[in-house]
Amino acid sequence: KLTIESTPFNVAEGKEVLLLVHNLPQHLFGYSWYKGERVDGNRQIIGYVIGTQQATPGPAYSGREIIYPNASLLIQNIIQNDTGFYTLHVIKSDLVNEEATGQFRVYPELPKPSISSNNSKPVEDKDAVAFTCEPETQDATYLWWVNNQSLPVSPRLQLSNGNRTLTLFNVTRNDTASYKCETQNPVSARRSDSVILNVLYGPDAPTISPLNTSYRSGENLNLSCHAASNPPAQYSWFVNGTFQQSTQELFIPNITVNNSGSYTCQAHNSDTGLNRTTVTTITVYAEPPKPFITSNNSNPVEDEDAVALTCEPEIQNTTYLWWVNNQSLPVSPRLQLSNDNRTLTLLSVTRNDVGPYECGIQNELSVDHSDPVILNVLYGPDDPTISPSYTYYRPGVNLSLSCHAASNPPAQYSWLIDGNIQQHTQELFISNITEKNSGLYTCQANNSASGHSRTTVKTITVSAELPKPSISSNNSKPVEDKDAVAFTCEPEAQNTTYLWWVNGQSLPVSPRLQLSNGNRTLTLFNVTRNDARAYVCGIQNSVSANRSDPVTLDVLYGPDTPIISPPDSSYLSGANLNLSCHSASNPSPQYSWRINGIPQQHTQVLFIAKITPNNNGTYACFVSNLATGRNNSIVKSITVSASGTSPGLSAGA
C-alpha cells in the first residue's frame, strides 16, 4: 500500500522536511503533490511525468519544493504555514489512479527564556514572590528548577498560568536559591539564566560570645555579637542601658569590678526594619569567687536520666577540679568531663551516684571548693522483700509481716491476701491466726515519683503440722575441688528443728561440712567425688517429724591420669596391637589417640592389625571432660621387633 512518511514529523521553522514515499507502484505514468488531504488542482504543488522526466509547478508551488524521481518531495526553509497534510496522486501506466496522504507539523525554534519577578527583595515570613517565565509562547511546556533540581513538593509552592508562573508564599530564608525556568516544544528546549532569590530576614536574636560571664579583674573583655540577618545586621552595644558604640565587637582592656553589669547587643536590619537584643550579665571578680554547682536535673531517675553538673561561675583560663565522695573522680565510662572540665556528666545515673560532689577552681595560691551537692536519684521500687521468711505458721500465733523495697522516694506499700486488698501499710499484723489465714500474701510497693510498682507474693500456710520437706540446691553439678554446694531444707518454718543425714547416717564431723541458718542449710565446701551421696533433711516441730526424699549429689570430676592397658610395651612383628585407655571421670571423658604426635582416632580403644617395626613409637591417650573443662593424658612407648629376634616378647592380642 502506498504510504507517505514525514521526516521529521515535527519540523522547526527554517529547516527542511522530506515527504518520503513508500511502496511506490511499478509502471507509472506520473505523479503529482497537492497541499491538503485531497487532490485539488488549485492546490497542486508540483507534477512529474516520468516519460519526459519533466516537473511542472502547480498553483501551490512556492519555489522551496523539490520533487525526486522516486516521488519523494523535499520542502526547504519551512515556514509556519507549511504545517498540515500533503497528498500524493500517482497515475499508473494503465491510467488507474492511487493516492496517499502524509503530514507534518511546524514549530517555531524557541528563544532563550527569562524570569521576571514581582518582588526582588521579599521579607521572610511576610511576602510572597511570583516568578514568571517569559516570553509567553503557544504550544510550549514550562518547567521550573530550584538549585538545578526539580521543584520540591511544598504547600508554599504553587504553579499557575499553565505552569508559566511559580509562586512562593510566605518566603523563608531557606527559599534563597537559584531558580531557572525552561520552555519546551517538540523541536526545542531552552533554559533561562538562573535568578537568585534574595530573601530579607532577621535579625534573629543575637548571640554574644564567648559565653563565660565571669572575669577576673585585670583581664581584657572582648565580646563579639552575631545575629543571622539579610542584609547583614548593624550592631550597637549598651552597658547598663547606656549606648557605647556601633560595632560588632566590644573591647574593654584591663577591666575592673566597675565593669560588672548588663551588656546588651542590639542588632538592626535596615531593610526589614527589625531590631533584636540580647543581654548578658558580666561579673568581674577582684579574686576568684567561691564556686558553686548547678545541675540540669535535680531529681534524676535511675537507669533513665543523665545529669550534667556544672561548676559556676565560668571563668576564662581557669582550671576546674571535681571530687566525688571526697575522692578524685574514678575512671568510669559513665563519667564524662567537658573539654574545659567545667561540666561533669553522669550518664545513666544509679542510686550509688548520690555523691556528695564538689567542684573546685584552682588559682595561683590555692583551690577554692564549692559546697558539696548531693544528687537525689529516684529509683525503685526494687522487688519487695517480705520478712520474716517463714512460709509455715502454727495456728494461734500472731502473724506479723513486714515488707521492704529499696526505693527513693520511699515506697508506698499495700497488702493483698488472695488478691484482695487489705491495707496500705508497710506491716501486716493478724492476731491469733487459724488455718483460714492460709493463702497468698502479696506486698505491693509503689514509687509515686517514678510511677513504678513491684510486687512479691508469699504463700503462707497455717498448720500445726509441717509438710514433707524438700531439698533445694544452689549447684546441681558441682566440680570437684572447685565448687561448694549449699543444700537448703524447705520450707522455712517457725519453731522448727532441722536435721540432716548422709547415706542414712547422721552428718560426719568434717571441716568441709557446715550447718547454718538454724541448721536449715548444709554447705559442702570444696566438694570431692566422695561427696556424691544421698542427702536427706528432716524437720520436726511440736506435732510432726518428717523426712525429705533423698537428693544425690552429682559431683563432676576428672579426668584423672588415664591408664593404658595392657601394660606391655614390647610386641612382635605381625601381632595385633589392641590398646585400651581408661580415666576416672564424671561425666565419662572423650578419648583420642596420637601416635608419634600425629592425631589418630577419637575412640577409647586403639586397634592396629599386624604391626611391624614401622609401628614403633610413642602412643599417647588424651582424655577431656567437657563438663569440668579439664584434660589429661598419658604416653606409652611401644617397641615392635622383627619376628624371632628377641625372646620373651608379647605375641599381641
Epitope: 487459724t434 497455717v462 498448720s463 503440722e465 547416717q505 528432716g538 520436726q540
Partner: antibody, heavy 120, light 106 residues
Framework: EVQLQQSGAELVRSGASVKLSCTAS????????MHWVKQRPEQGLEWIAW????????EYAPKFRGKATLTADSSSNTAYLHLSSLTSEDTAVYYC?????????????WGQGTSVAVSS | QIVLTQSPAIMSASPGEKVTITCSAS?????MHWFQQKPGTSPKLWIY???NLASGVPARFSGSGSGTSYSLTISRMEAEDAATYYC?????????FGAGTKLEIK
C-alpha cells in the same frame, strides 16, 4: 533406748488436784515436745496439750485450759501434768508421748499411762 | 475444731480378708496419722503422714487419702491385727482423734 516412765496410779477425792510425772530416758526432753493424751475407760483418745521443755511454751486444747497445767524440769528430764478441781469426768488413763528422731527414723514413744480415779 | 469421723465403729474380719477403715475430716487436713491400741497397752503410732508405715509395721498395712477423706487398709487380715485403730489430725489445734474403729478377728 528411749523410754518414758510415768508415775503410778492415783486415787483422789473429787475437787482435789493431782500431779502426774513422766520421766524420760535415752534422750533429752529439752530437745523435744512432750504431749499428753487422755483416755477415759472404754473411750477414745483426747489430746490435752504439749509443752516445749526448753522454754516452757505450751499449747492446750481449749477443753483443758484451766483444768490441766503442763510443766517440765530439765534437770530431772521429767515432764509433769497437773490436774485441778477433779471430777468424775477426769477419771481416765493419762499418757505422755513424744515424737522424736531416733537415728534416721521418726519415732513416736508413749509412756505406759497413769490411771487416775476420782472418788466422791 | 476439726472433727474426725471413723467408720465403721466396730467390725470383724476373717483371716486373709481385706479390711478398710475410713476417716472423714470436717475440714481439709494436711496429713492423717493412724494409731493402733490393744487392750491394756499404750497406743502405738502405726501409719504417719497419711501413707508412711511406722517402724515394725507389717507391709500388709497401707494408708491413703487427701483433703478430708483418708483410709487405712489391711490387704490380708491376720489375728495379730485385731485391735482398735484411731486416726489423728495434727494440722490445726486442738489436735483431734477419731472415736476409733474396733477390729476383731472372726
Amino acid at each position: 533406748e528411749v523410754q518414758l516412765q510415768q508415775s503410778g496410779a492415783e486415787l483422789v477425792r473429787s475437787g482435789a488436784s493431782v500431779k502426774l510425772s513422766c520421766t524420760a530416758s535415752g534422750f533429752n526432753i529439752k530437745d523435744n515436745y512432750m504431749h499428753w493424751v487422755k483416755q477415759r475407760p472404754e473411750q477414745g483418745l483426747e489430746w490435752i496439750a504439749w509443752i516445749d521443755p526448753e522454754n516452757g511454751d505450751t499449747e492446750y486444747a481449749p477443753k483443758f485450759r484451766g483444768k490441766a497445767t503442763l510443766t517440765a524440769d530439765s534437770s530431772s528430764n521429767t515432764a509433769y501434768l497437773h490436774l485441778s478441781s477433779l471430777t468424775s469426768e477426769d477419771t481416765a488413763v493419762y499418757y505422755c508421748h513424744v515424737l522424736i528422731y531416733a537415728g534416721y527414723l521418726a519415732m513416736d514413744y508413749w509412756g505406759q499411762g497413769t490411771s487416775v480415779a476420782v472418788s466422791s | 475444731q476439726i472433727v474426725l469421723t471413723q467408720s465403721p465403729a466396730i467390725m470383724s474380719a476373717s483371716p486373709g480378708e481385706k479390711v478398710t477403715i475410713t476417716c472423714s475430716a470436717s475440714s481439709s487436713v494436711t496429713y492423717m496419722h493412724w494409731f493402733q491400741q490393744k487392750p491394756g497397752t499404750s497406743p502405738k503410732l502405726w501409719i504417719y503422714s497419711t501413707s508412711n508405715l511406722a517402724s515394725g509395721v507389717p507391709a500388709r498395712f497401707s494408708g491413703s487419702g487427701s483433703g478430708t477423706s483418708y483410709s487405712l487398709t489391711i490387704s490380708r487380715m491376720e489375728a495379730e491385727d485385731a485391735a482398735t485403730y484411731y486416726c489423728q489430725q495434727r494440722s490445726t489445734y486442738p489436735l483431734t482423734f477419731g472415736a476409733g474403729t474396733k477390729l476383731e478377728i472372726k
